[in-house]
């Protein structure tokens, strides 16, 4: 898993301070309160975010 | 490394009573949901049961093929898992896997146990 | 409950070749930014082991020669190019709704 800081995760994915990975944004749905969901719901869906983060 | 070992499994009678145990190391337990799943030759992967977090307050969920006859439980404070099964049938018998998963899927598995019902 | 079919039931699959196995849902688990699928692995005399969850997400430590796509109902797990070790049942599971349910497996036969 990437470090923070050092490339974001990637598409569909989220960092997770907590669990210290990436996560993937589609189990927000089941876990909604968890540290990385709130990076899923800012993130726009395009892939400029990996450009531009 | 992750580790779930099931214990518990056995030769029983139909009509009786069993209870399954699961301990698990190598994550962080009272931050996973934890299920029940059985496997038989006849109806294949058979999700049964499922335990969220004290978060959730402990919610369960059963498949209705064990509601009102299987409870699920778990003790955070031993990393410990348990199923307990009454009126055990012979469609009862299988293997049982304690299984974990951060969300709805199954990280985590354990070798398994087998029920055996059976006069 | 949401019936899942895998299809087939068994194939046998030349090393260094494309193996594809089908699982298709009785109704649709996907919205419109995710499918709620899973695929395992399943050795002889061993559990499950997760390959791929949400459709195309490879887990941890599994291999890029196994991806996933699909949407809707369709689902397609691929394993390329085949090696001895992936000689295994395979199984999709759907996280739709409770009660999860498991497809009846595909037996993946190497030669």
């Known amino acids: 898993e990437q470090a923070p800081g050092t490339a974001p995760c990637s598409r569909g994915r989220s960092w997770s301070a907590d669990l210290d990975k990436c996560m993937d944004c589609a189990s927000c749905r089941a876990r909604p309160h968890s540290d990385f969901c709130l990076g899923c719901a800012a993130a726009p869906p395009a892939p400029f975010r990996l450009l531009w983060p | 490394e992750v580790k779930l070992e099931e214990s518990g499994g056995g030769l029983v009678q139909p009509g009786g009573s069993m209870k399954l145990s699961c301990v698990a190391s190598g994550f962080t337990f009272n931050n996973y949901w934890m299920s029940w799943v059985r496997q038989s030759p006849e109806k294949g992967l058979e999700w049964l049961a499922e335990i969220r977090l004290k978060s959730d307050n402990y919610a369960t969920h059963y498949a209705e093929s064990v509601k009102g006859k299987f409870t699920i439980s778990r003790d955070d404070s031993k990393s410990r898992l348990y199923l307990q099964m009454n009126n055990l049938r012979a469609e009862n018998t299988g293997i049982y896997y304690c299984?974990?998963?951060?969300?709805?899927?199954?990280?985590?598995w354990g070798q398994g146990t087998t029920l055996t019902v059976s006069s | 409950d949401i019936v899942l079919t895998q299809s087939p039931a068994s194939l046998t699959v030349s090393l260094g070749q494309r193996a594809t196995i089908s699982c298709r849902a009785s109704?649709?688990?996907?919205?419109?930014?995710?499918?709620?699928m899973q695929w395992y692995q399943q050795r002889p005399g061993q559990p499950p082991k997760l390959l791929i969850k949400?459709?195309?997400n490879l887990d941890s430590g599994v291999p890029a020669r196994f991806s996933g796509s699909g949407s809707g109902t369709d689902f397609t797990l691929n394993i390329h190019p085949v090696e001895e070790e992936d000689a295994a049942t395979y199984y999709c599971?759907?996280?739709?709704?409770?009660?999860?349910?498991f497809g009846g497996g595909t037996k993946l036969e190497i030669k």
């Open positions: 599971q759907h996280s739709w709704e409770i009660p999860y349910t």
């Open positions: 299984t974990g998963g951060f969300a709805d899927y199954f990280d985590y």
């Open positions: 109704q649709s688990v996907s919205t419109s930014s995710y499918s709620y």
């Open positions: 949400y459709a195309t």
